[in-house]
Every structure is written in structure tokens, then in C-alpha cells.
């Protein structure tokens, strides 16, 4: 049985302030079951950016329909980017549990924010 992979194809993305940023992430398998979450930064102080399971993330929308049972694309779009959004974003697969257990992280995508053209 092949090991599940979390694929973040872009190492870096550059976006102008005020625009939207698309952060791509796909998984190689839907099993084992468990949620995908997006974080900015790594380690214990990382910031939760998006979690399909629960929570309200008004600036974040999934690129693909996450309610499709065969969905393997967990890319997100973040609107109205500001310099404060700069950082490295990680797509993380969890295995179900109490609590859910981190299984594998993508390599990360560094988001840089350019000044808005005048």
C-alpha cells in the first residue's frame, strides 16, 4: 500500500496587495480518512488558516468543491491579500482520532506580497 502524499507544487507564490492568492494542494489518496487543514508557519505556534471541518474563515474559499466524495484537491484561495499575510503555508493531512492525528504535511508554499501598483 503506497504511502499517502501531500503535494504542494509551488514552492513560492507572489501576489500584489489587494489581490487573491491561490495556494495549491492535492493528496494522492483519500484513505485513511481524516481532515485537511491549512496552516501558516510550522511548529506549535502555527496559525490555522482553513479547516473544512469547522470554523469560520471569511477570506478563504476552497478552489474545488470539498463536498465531492472523490475530491483530492484541497487548494484554497485567500482574498484581499495584505503584507501581514506573508509567510509559508502548509497543507496538512490528519488521520481521524480523538483528537485527530497529524499524518503528513506538504512541503509548504511561501507567499510573498508585492506592493500594490500605483
Amino acid at each position: 500500500e503506497e504511502e499517502l502524499q501531500v503535494i504542494q507544487p509551488e514552492k513560492s507564490v507572489s501576489v500584489a496587495a489587494g489581490d487573491s492568492a491561490t495556494l495549491n494542494c492535492t493528496v494522492s489518496s483519500l484513505i485513511p480518512v481524516g481532515p485537511i487543514q491549512w496552516f501558516r508557519g510550522a511548529g506549535p505556534g502555527r496559525e490555522l488558516i482553513y479547516n473544512l471541518k469547522e470554523g469560520h474563515f471569511p477570506r478563504v474559499t476552497p478552489v474545488s468543491d470539498p463536498t465531492k466524495r472523490n475530491n483530492m484537491d484541497f487548494s484554497i484561495r485567500i482574498s484581499n491579500i495584505t503584507p501581514a499575510d506573508a509567510g509559508t503555508y502548509y497543507c496538512v493531512k490528519f488521520r481521524k482520532g480523538s483528537p485527530d492525528v497529524e499524518l503528513k504535511s506538504g512541503a509548504g508554499t511561501e507567499l510573498s506580497v508585492r506592493a500594490k501598483p500605483s
Epitope: 483519500l30 484513505i31 485513511p32 480518512v33 481532515p35 473544512l52 471541518k53 469547522e54 468543491d65 470539498p66 463536498t67 465531492k68 466524495r69 472523490n70 481521524k96 480523538s98
Partner: antibody, heavy 118, light 108 residues
Framework: EVQLVESGGGVVQPGGSLRLSCAAS????????MSWVRQAPGKGLEWVAG????????YYPASVKGRFTISRDNSKNTLYLQMNSLRAEDTAVYYC???????????WGQGTLVTVSS | SYELTQPPSVSVSPGQTARITCSGG??????YAWYQQKPGQAPVTLIY???KRPSNIPERFSGSSSGTTVTLTISGVQAEDEADYYC???????????FGGGTKLTVL
């Protein structure tokens, strides 16, 4: 308050057709996957169809595949189940149910009775 | 026939603890839920995602999982808990929603 109200049940002859409706309110219908679950008299629950939030992807068990079609109109907040080539064993109360992020059911309608009899 | 297996009946005295088990699904590809149904009524969701309880459900209802078996525990059973209880699942390997055959809980 989440509300799901089914309609369209009735008596139909074997080989006949029927379309059930489920009117949804109290939540963002277009963001949730939905399903139909039935219960034959004195029997247990049986899932018969599921549909993604956008309506592009549908799912069925072998028992109804090719005879039942689930669809939705997000502009009307309504879920449908088109049932063709009905058989006596399709006699049941049909419930519509809202799906959670991982395709379990959190809210149920009150059900509508379908009787297939000559 | 039902893909998930649960006992047809369980009896318990008021105030005691009732446990209903459900098995048959692969741990790695299944999520489980528990539904309560009283005669002539629609099902009500008691537990989802194996052990999560909706906010409107009393704390005496809890879910747990161990390997391929999940358990619904009702602590301090009350007369109003007499009902049919269904184990339901989502199977990611087949994109289907199997159910157990139901367990009739009798409060003695």
C-alpha cells in the same frame, strides 16, 4: 433553525415513476452535500442517494442505481429524487438529510411515504 | 442484509448504563455516526464523526471507537431513551453510507 420538508410521496403502481422534493431552510443550502435515506415499513434505514453541494457529483448504492436520480436546485433551496421503474420493495418512508463535512448526516426531514402497489 | 453489525436488542434498567456496539467497517476508511429513532418519528443524530455530539444532545450520550468497533454509551438511562438506535457510516473506499440493522433499547 435548520428545516427540511419532504413532499411528493404517494401511491404508485409497479413500474411507475414519482418525484420527491425536499425544501431546505435555515442554512446555506448551496454549501452542503445532501442525501436521501429510506425506511421500509418495520425495517431499518437505507441510504439511497447523495449529491455534492454544487450538484455535479451524485452517488448511489447498487440497489437503486440506474432507476433513481438525485438532483438539486440551489436557487430554490430544493433537493429532488426522481424514482423510475418503481418496485414493491421501494415502498418506504423517504427522508432527506443534510450531510456533514465527512458525509454523515446531521439533520433529517420528517419523511414522505411512498407506496408501490397495484 | 446490513453492512454494519449491531445487536438487535439491548435492555437496561433506569439509571444504569447502556452500551450498543457496531462493527464491520474498516477503521482507515470509515467515519461513524449514531442515530436515534422513536416510533413514528424521523431519526435524530446523536453522534457523528465517531465521537462528536451535537450541541442539542444531552451529555449522557457519548460515542467511542476502538479498532473496527464503535460504541454508543448512554449513561444514566431514562425512560425517554427507549427507542431504536442505528449505527451509520460513511465508507470513503466506496463513497457509500452503510447502516446497521438497528438496536431496540428497552428500558425495564
Amino acid at each position: 433553525e435548520v428545516q427540511l420538508v419532504e413532499s411528493g410521496g404517494g401511491v404508485v403502481q409497479p413500474g411507475g415513476s414519482l418525484r420527491l422534493s425536499c425544501a431546505a431552510s435555515g442554512f446555506t443550502f448551496s454549501s452542503n452535500a445532501m442525501s436521501w435515506v429510506r425506511q421500509a415499513p418495520g425495517k431499518g434505514l437505507e441510504w439511497v442517494a447523495g449529491i455534492s453541494a454544487g450538484g455535479s457529483d451524485t452517488y448511489y448504492p447498487a440497489s437503486v442505481k440506474g432507476r433513481f436520480t438525485i438532483s438539486r436546485d440551489n436557487s430554490k433551496n430544493t433537493l429532488y429524487l426522481q424514482m423510475n421503474s418503481l418496485r414493491a420493495e421501494d415502498t418506504a418512508v423517504y427522508y432527506c438529510a443534510r450531510e456533514t463535512w465527512n458525509h454523515l448526516f446531521d439533520y433529517w426531514g420528517q419523511g414522505t411515504l411512498v407506496t408501490v402497489s397495484s | 442484509s446490513y453492512e454494519l453489525t449491531q445487536p438487535p436488542s439491548v435492555s437496561v434498567s433506569p439509571g444504569q448504563t447502556a452500551r450498543i456496539t457496531c462493527s464491520g467497517g474498516s477503521y482507515s476508511s470509515y467515519y461513524y455516526a449514531w442515530y436515534q429513532q422513536k416510533p413514528g418519528q424521523a431519526p435524530v443524530t446523536l453522534i457523528y464523526s465517531d465521537d462528536k455530539r451535537p450541541s442539542n444532545i444531552p451529555e449522557r450520550f457519548s460515542g467511542s471507537s476502538s479498532g473496527t468497533t464503535v460504541t454508543l454509551t448512554i449513561s444514566g438511562v431514562q425512560a425517554e431513551d427507549e427507542a431504536d438506535y442505528y449505527c451509520g457510516g460513511y465508507d470513503q473506499s466506496s463513497y457509500t453510507n452503510p447502516f446497521g440493522g438497528g438496536t431496540k433499547l428497552t428500558v425495564l
